[in-house]
């Protein structure tokens, strides 16, 4: 969480951003809030990016003002116009690109004053893993697949019964480049699996951590997965 202040005295307003990550090819949110102002027509929101000459986005007098927008963001940005009056200056970024990563500044002017805060935006690819029993294998085998990751993640297996055990000798992980030549499909196979145990496939890079769990018993198979972004720090 980054909290920025404007000029000292009564002309400063608090602006708060949250570092976040974008999943390339999907839409992302750059989060920014400020002390709300009841005078909508006086509110100005400017999003800037370090190293970019034009503006990322500008909102003033109740609407988008995109005449100064940089070419790389053309047609890809929007604020939540109906939320500006309650202090939400967050930016929606469509079709996130790898090159969107960097330091952004959320700069706010209201009738009460000015303020700004920086935001670190990381970009990459992350997806939920799915763990299945591989019935084609000669021994009891689990197969963990996740369709899109970048940068290349690490994959670690764990088990509820054998806590702390190192499964690197009995697992094999491969990375297959996807058709857009950036993201990769992750496939990890775990051999010599025992029944009545819960196994976890953990995939992690510097942006996200995802876990796929599978519980295999004689009568049923239960699956669960979740994904967590690693760098959601407020500023």
């Amino acid at each position: 969480l980054i909290i920025g202040f404007g000029i000292s005295g009564r002309h400063s307003i608090t602006v708060t951003t949250v570092a976040s990550a974008g999943n390339i090819g999907e839409d992302g949110i750059l989060s920014c809030t400020f002390e709300p102002d009841i005078k909508l027509s006086d509110i100005v929101i400017q999003w800037l990016k370090e190293g970019v000459l034009g503006l990322v986005h500008e909102f003033k007098e109740g609407k988008d003002e995109l005449s100064e927008q940089d070419e790389m963001f053309r047609g890809r940005t929007a604020v939540f116009a109906d939320q500006v009056i309650v202090g939400n200056a967050s930016l929606r970024l469509k079709n996130v690109q790898l090159t969107d990563a960097g330091t952004y500044k959320c700069y706010i002017i209201t009738s009460k004053g000015k303020g700004n805060a920086n935001l670190e935006y990381k970009t990459g690819a992350f997806s939920m893993p799915e763990v299945n029993v591989d019935y084609n294998a000669s021994s009891e085998t689990l197969r963990c697949e996740a369709p899109r990751w970048f940068p290349q993640p690490t994959v670690v297996w764990a088990s509820q019964v054998d806590q702390g055990a190192n499964f690197s000798e009995v697992s094999n992980t491969s990375f297959e480049l996807n058709s857009e030549n950036v993201t990769m499909k992750v496939v990890s196979v775990l051999y010599n699996v025992t029944i009545n145990n819960t196994y976890s496939c953990m995939i992690e890079n510097d942006i996200a951590k995802a876990t796929g769990d599978i519980k295999v018993t004689e009568s049923e198979i239960k699956r669960r997965s979740h994904l967590q972004l690693l760098n959601s720090k407020a500023s």
């Epitope: 009841i38 909508l40 027509s41 609407k63 116009a81 109906d82 939320q83 309650v86 202090g87």
Partner: antibody, heavy 117, light 107 residues
């Protein structure tokens, strides 16, 4: 859930003052503007003013400037509206209303103020 | 101050009717307009925000549209519980101002 609970009805004499309270629960009181709107019998809605409790910033409608005072007690999440030099035309229902998710999204139940000699 | 002219001031309609209420601003309010419903003895109820977005729990028979200076609230098929007074509110320019209200009565 969000609730705005106002104080009870008041009967006042011309020239007196009235102070209406509005106790808030269910959202961060200090971080959002609280407004006051009044409605005379059989009439429309009229905005009076607003307060930002976190900084005690206030904004008033020109019509009420100098006669209305908005305050807030952040320890009890309560907003107050005081109207002085009352006259018969001030007989109305007074509402507090929040701007939490949107402008005037939640309303108090209203406080009837009757000004009569 | 921006003036909001609401019309009609009252109308009579039957259950099932399509009802349209308009609000005209004295200048462009850039879609910064909400609608409220009020029944006798009750506070206004938040209905539509930012011209066309339905507030939580509001039935889909209510809809809003408009831009610039002209805005409309439509009830596609009037129900008995919709008989009430409706107000528009502009919050683009300070101070916020309400329309005069439209009373929807049973024919």
């Amino acid at each position: 859930q969000v609730q705005l609970v106002q104080s009870g009805a008041e009967v006042k004499k011309p020239g007196a003052s009235v102070k209406v309270s509005c106790k808030v629960s269910g959202y961060p009181f200090t971080s959002y503007w609280m407004h006051w709107v009044r409605q005379a019998p059989g009439q429309g809605l009229e905005w009076m003013g607003a307060i930002y409790p976190g900084k005690s910033d206030t904004e008033y409608a020109q019509k009420f400037q100098g006669r209305v005072t908005l305050t807030a007690d952040t320890s009890t999440s309560t907003a107050y509206m005081e109207l002085s030099s009352l006259r018969s035309e001030d007989t109305a229902v007074y509402y507090c209303t929040s701007t939490w998710t949107h402008y005037f999204d939640y309303w108090g139940q209203g406080t009837t103020v009757t000004v009569s000699s | 101050d921006i003036q909001m002219t609401q019309s009609p001031s009252s109308l009579s309609a039957s259950v099932g009717d399509r009802v349209t209420i308009t609000c005209q601003a004295t200048q462009d309010i850039v879609k910064s307009l909400n609608w409220y419903q009020q029944k006798p003895g009750k506070p206004p109820k938040f209905l539509i925000y930012y011209t066309a977005q339905l507030a939580e729990g509001v039935p889909s028979r209510f809809s809003g549209s408009g831009s610039g200076t002209d805005y409309t609230l439509t009830i596609s098929s009037l129900q008995s519980e919709d008989f009430a007074t409706y107000y528009c509110l502009q919050f683009y320019e300070f101070p916020p101002t309400f329309g005069g209200g439209t009373k929807v009565e049973i024919k």
